[in-house]
Every structure is written in structure tokens, then in C-alpha cells.
Interface confidence: medium
């Protein structure tokens, strides 16, 4: 829902969280605003207080229930409103009819760990967090490895076009410190986007054995 200099964007984590960002040029800093969620076929509604993340941008998380509870389905529509207090009144500043499974952004993968490391390769595994069982295996992943002297932005992206929660990194340099990140995206949803990157996993390849070509 966009109005010139106003933008209201929300994503569903596929379980029990809708995260929203509202940006509005010239909005009053000291105004109390909230996001109100009103599902079309559920008995609950939920609000969260918008907190500033920059001079003209506010964010909040609608917590719909326990982290792994399935609070919405593919047929749900949730009316999301930004309400700002003006005296005793609540004014509607932005509104959208939100289709949760068209606007997915999963939680970052967790529990990254080195399964096995050698001189030139490393096997890494991870887990997805709070992802709906509706996806079954319809997920994809992107991974990147930070090499010495480079930035994350320079790191080539490795794409896993299936639900594969491990990777074997090859052609690594012996006795070298690396960092690794992964992110996940469901195949479903017109406006679905990648999860945030996982926390980096640091690992070091084994040194080459002296006098041996490994």
C-alpha cells in the first residue's frame, strides 16, 4: 500500500509473526502509532506499537501466537492498518488487505554447524526456523562464503534449488579462516522475499600436511 511518500510493507514468517515497516515523510516523531491486524476468518485480532527505526520509518512485529503455531493459512486475508493517535482519536494512516502466503519472509536459518572440514572442503548443515509445514519441500536456499580480503557483497551466491539443509563447500584454501551464511525462501508467493541471512558461521580449513599434496 503506497501513497506517494508513504509506504506500508509487511511480511509473514509463515507461522505466527507478521513484521511490518511503515515509512512516511513528514510524519510526527512524537505521535503514537500502531499496526492493527484484523483477519477475515479468525476470531482474534492483534496490534503492535510502531517504533522508530529511522527518522521517517517505523517497524513492529505482530505476534500472533506461539512461535511454531500455524496461525494463518493460504486462504486467509488480514486487513492491516496503521493507526496513529490524534488526541482521543485513532486515524487510519495506511491500510492493506494482506494475503499472508503471498508475502512471505521466513526467519533466518539457525543452528549452523560444521559437520566435517578438510583442507580444501567443508560440509556445513543448518536448520530452518518457524517454517510452515505447508511448504513441504518447496523451499530454496542461497549461501555465500566470505573469503579473506573480500566483503560479503563480493561473495558469489550458491543456489540450492531444493530443500537441502547442508552444503559441501569445495576448492577452499588450506589453513584459511572463512565465514559462511545461508538464507531461505519459499517458492510460494507473488511478493515473497528471501529471509535475512543467517548469523555467520566461522570455520577454518585444515592445514595441508607437510610434504603432501592434499
Amino acid at each position: 500500500a503506497v501513497n506517494g511518500t508513504s509506504q506500508f510493507t509487511c511480511f509473514y514468517n509463515s507461522r505466527a509473526n507478521i513484521s511490518c515497516v511503515w515509512s512516511q515523510d513528514g510524519a510526527l516523531q512524537d505521535t503514537s502509532c500502531q499496526v492493527h491486524a484484523w483477519p477475515d476468518r479468525r476470531r482474534w485480532n492483534q496490534t503492535c506499537e510502531l517504533l522508530p527505526v529511522s527518522q521517517a520509518s517505523w517497524a513492529c512485529n505482530l505476534i500472533l501466537g506461539a512461535p511454531d503455531s500455524q496461525k494463518l493459512t493460504t486462504v486467509d486475508i488480514v486487513t492491516l492498518r496503521v493507526l496513529c493517535r490524534e488526541g482521543v482519536r485513532w486515524r487510519v494512516m495506511a491500510i492493506q488487505d494482506f494475503k499472508p502466503f503471498e508475502n512471505l519472509r521466513l526467519m533466518a536459518p539457525i543452528s549452523l554447524q560444521v559437520v566435517h572440514v578438510e583442507t580444501h572442503r567443508c560440509n556445513i548443515s543448518w536448520e530452518i526456523s518457524q517454517a510452515s509445514h505447508y511448504f513441504e519441500r518447496h523451499l530454496e536456499f542461497e549461501a555465500r562464503t566470505l573469503s579473506p580480503g573480500h566483503t560479503w557483497e563480493e561473495a558469489p551466491l550458491l543456489t540450492l534449488k531444493q530443500k537441502q539443509e547442508w552444503i559441501c563447500l569445495e576448492t577452499l584454501t588450506p589453513d584459511t579462516q572463512y565465514e559462511f551464511q545461508v538464507r531461505v525462501k519459499p517458492l510460494q508467493g507473488e511478493f515473497t522475499t528471501w529471509s535475512p541471512w543467517s548469523q555467520p558461521l566461522a570455520f577454518r580449513t585444515k592445514p595441508a600436511a607437510l610434504g603432501k599434496d592434499t
Epitope: A1, N3, S6, H36, D40, T79, R81, L83, R89, W90, R91, V92, M93, A94, I95, D97
Partner: nanobody, 123 residues
Framework: QVQLQESGGGLVQAGGSLRLSCAAS????????MAWFRQAPGKEREFVAS????????DYVDSVKGRFTVSRDNAKNTVYLQMNNLKPEDTAVYYC????????????????WGQGTQVTVSS
Amino acid sequence: QVQLQESGGGLVQAGGSLRLSCAASGDVFVRYTMAWFRQAPGKEREFVASVTDSGRTTDYVDSVKGRFTVSRDNAKNTVYLQMNNLKPEDTAVYYCAANTDYFQIRSLEFNTWGQGTQVTVSS
């Protein structure tokens, strides 16, 4: 704020139908709960019907339930009042009103009003 312009009023016989339109301009229409009010000669202005910003909730005064239907087209920035089985007591000036106050539905304290359109129902 929005500016509102009603149209569609006129003279109709009892039992007939009219469709009122209210075109909005000047602001983001979808932010507003829209309502129709009416004022008959010598009487106070009264609430007729309302539709919330998303169009999901409508409300009617008891005297028009089952005869009048309020709707909105957010793509066209327009709210409608379909009036069927009109009665002489429906004769009044009909006003379109807009409000961004989330909890004000039937109140006369709507932010913005149109100029009104005359509906006359003859017996």
C-alpha cells in the same frame, strides 16, 4: 483531506430505485470509512449507512436494512448507495461523509462532508 461530490439523486415513485454515487478526490480514499447520512425537511441529519475502509464491514440504520446497500470501489475512489423499494419517508437530502477515525462509524463528527444530493420519493 478528501473532497466529496455526490450524484444520482432525483425524483422517483414509491417502490422505485436510485443509485447514489460519491466521488472522492484529494487524498488516499482507502484510508477513509465512508458513510451516507440524510436530512429530511425540518428534521435533524441522520445516519443511513457506512462502509469501512477495506469494504469488509457495513452498517445500516434499521429503517433501511434490506432495502439499501452501501458499497465502495477503492480503485475508482467512489462509494455507492443502492436504494431499492424507496418510500416517501426516504425523501431527504443525502450526504456523503468521510472519516479516518477508526472508531467513529455512526457519529455526526465525520471529518468531511459532501454538498448533498436531493432524493424525492413521490407516492
